[in-house]
């Protein structure tokens, strides 16, 4: 699957149990930020803001296009589903010990900037990707991954940390964003929705995908994560969208089949090593890139985000397993664990391919609105 080159279609469904966008930051021309879905109240809420449910059903995605495994979102029907009158499922957490409201959560108090001031920063993640506005950068070469094909032993630690499922990665997984931009993979984790409700963090032209994988990397210039936090390029995350396909994804099944063992928050298990690169799209040459932040507290900025143009396919059953197995703090299901999209505030998303050019009949003169910032690199 490849991400579409989008036209001005209506955004497709999906809602967030994350936080609303920071206020006072929408001071740029409207074309910089696409219309976003209405998100439940959360991180940046002001008193008196309307609490909109804004949860819509994701339309089924099963068309085949001429190009093998290629899907354009503009080919999909737009489905207007009624808003879910219920609160987002991850909004109300009951803690096992008392009613402490001071730890962070998706879609609820406290506001994230109270947990970490960086969450109110101007260059936050995730964002809505508008391919038409992306700057084509020929200097963005194919990503290089080395050592990602792991043997079964030693085993890896898979943990339900209460806000995601995280796989610890051993030393030796090397990734290069380009010459001199070298990183070591630390861990990967996933973000997802709930039944009929997509849960990717990034969106494309307002379309939210069923789920998203993040592989977190530390720059080789730093020995520890805490040293790299907030430093430009200190951390890099590879992100890919997960979509529904007709077949079971055998790579993901190696993890998903173990989720029942770690249903409880904080629990962990050991899984055999696997080919980590098989969890990512096969096309390392076509991607979007921008500088943003961690998508959970502490929300540190300076993170280089690389979002693959190609998507990864999982079966409907696998996506259901992902969204319906784990439990978070208290008695709440671990679902809808994604943050609302944040304003670009002048940032330009770069593309390693001419994403703004479309051969669709509906595309008028394709115009590349932004120029590549890294052309001289």
């Amino acid at each position: 699957q490849r991400l579409p080159r989008m036209q001005e279609d209506s955004p497709l469904g999906g809602g967030s149990s994350g936080e609303d966008d920071p206020l006072g930051e929408e001071d740029l021309p409207s074309e910089e930020d696409s219309p976003r879905e209405e998100d439940p109240p959360g991180e940046e809420d002001l008193p008196g803001e309307e609490d909109l449910p804004g949860e819509e059903d994701l339309p089924e995605v099963k068309p085949k296009s001429e190009e093998e495994g290629s899907l354009k979102l503009e080919d999909l029907p737009t489905v207007e589903a009624p808003g879910d009158p219920q609160e987002p499922q991850n909004n109300a957490h009951r803690d096992k010990e008392g009613d402490d409201q001071s730890h962070w959560r998706y879609g609820g108090d406290p506001p994230w900037p109270r947990v970490s001031p960086a969450c109110a920063g101007r260059f936050q993640s995730p964002v809505d990707i508008r391919p038409q506005l992306a700057a084509f950068c020929p200097a963005l070469r194919p990503l290089e991954l080395l050592g990602f094909q792991l043997p079964p032993l030693p085993e890896l630690r898979l943990r339900n940390n209460g806000h995601s499922v995280q796989l610890t990665l051993p030393p030796g997984l090397e990734m290069a964003l380009g010459p001199g931009r070298e990183y070591r993979a630390l861990q990967l984790h996933l973000h997802w929705g709930a039944a009929g409700r997509p849960g990717s963090e990034h969106t494309v032209e307002g379309h939210r995908f069923p789920a998203e994988i993040h592989v977190v990397h530390l720059s080789t210039a730093f020995a520890r994560v805490d040293e790299a936090l907030g430093r430009p390029g200190g951390l890099a995350v590879l992100a890919a969208f997960l979509e529904e396909g007709p077949e079971e994804n055998s790579a993901y099944e190696q993890l998903l089949s173990r989720l029942e063992e770690i249903a409880e928050e904080g629990s962990e298990t050991q899984v055999p090593g696997l080919d980590i690169s098989a969890l990512l799209p096969s096309d390392f040459s076509r991607y979007f890139q921008y500088e943003g932040s961690l998508t959970t507290p502490p929300c540190a900025q300076g993170v280089i985000w690389t979002v693959f143009n190609q998507t990864v396919m999982l079966s409907a059953k696998q996506l259901h397993t992902l969204s319906d197995t784990l439990w978070g703090p208290g008695d709440s299901r671990l679902q809808l664990n994604f943050r609302a999209t944040q304003p670009l505030n002048g940032r330009v998303i770069e593309a390693s391919f001419p994403a703004g050019v479309d051969s669709s009949p509906r595309a008028a003169e394709p115009v590349q609105l932004n120029s590549c910032l890294a052309a001289g690199d």
Epitope: D100, V115, L186, S267
Partner: nanobody, 127 residues
Framework: QVQLQESGGGLMHDGDSLRLSCAAS????????MGWFRQAPGKEREFVAA????????YYADSVKGRFTISRDNAKNTVYLQMNSLKPEDTAVYYC????????????????????WGQGTQVTVSS
């Protein structure tokens, strides 16, 4: 940056109870899993107890299970270790540690997975 300061240590007798506290500076306390480790003279640092970022899950070393209780108050940026039925073999320097969610995701039992450490507080249990 998170800075940790332990307190509450002291000289105790066999069977006594004691509560250690670990105060964290910085406003990101609730994003960290927290752990207690201890190191006796001439021995390696060993895991004692840990608690997840939300407080929803706790973990204990077999040697302290049923006697020690870890808890946290995110509003006060503090994690506690309630130690009951103390034994002479509990004598050690007790360290508080914080594990950030974006680290390598090591086991709660693994000291290498913790990003920040306190200076330690001495607990001595005499028979």
């Amino acid at each position: 940056q998170v800075q940790l300061q332990e307190s509450g240590g002291g000289l105790m007798h066999d069977g006594d109870s004691l509560r250690l506290s670990c105060a964290a500076s910085g406003r990101t306390f609730s994003t960290y899993a927290m752990g207690w480790f201890r190191q006796a003279p001439g021995k390696e640092r060993e895991f004692v107890a840990a608690i997840s970022w939300s407080g929803g899950s706790t973990y204990y070393a077999d040697s302290v299970k049923g006697r020690f209780t870890i808890s946290r108050d995110n509003a006060k940026n503090t994690v506690y270790l309630q130690m009951n039925s103390l034994k002479p073999e509990d004598t050690a320097v007790y360290y508080c540690a914080a594990e950030g969610i974006y680290n390598s995701g090591s086991s709660y039992h693994d000291a290498n997975g913790y990003d920040y450490w306190g200076q330690g507080t001495q607990v001595t249990v005499s028979s």
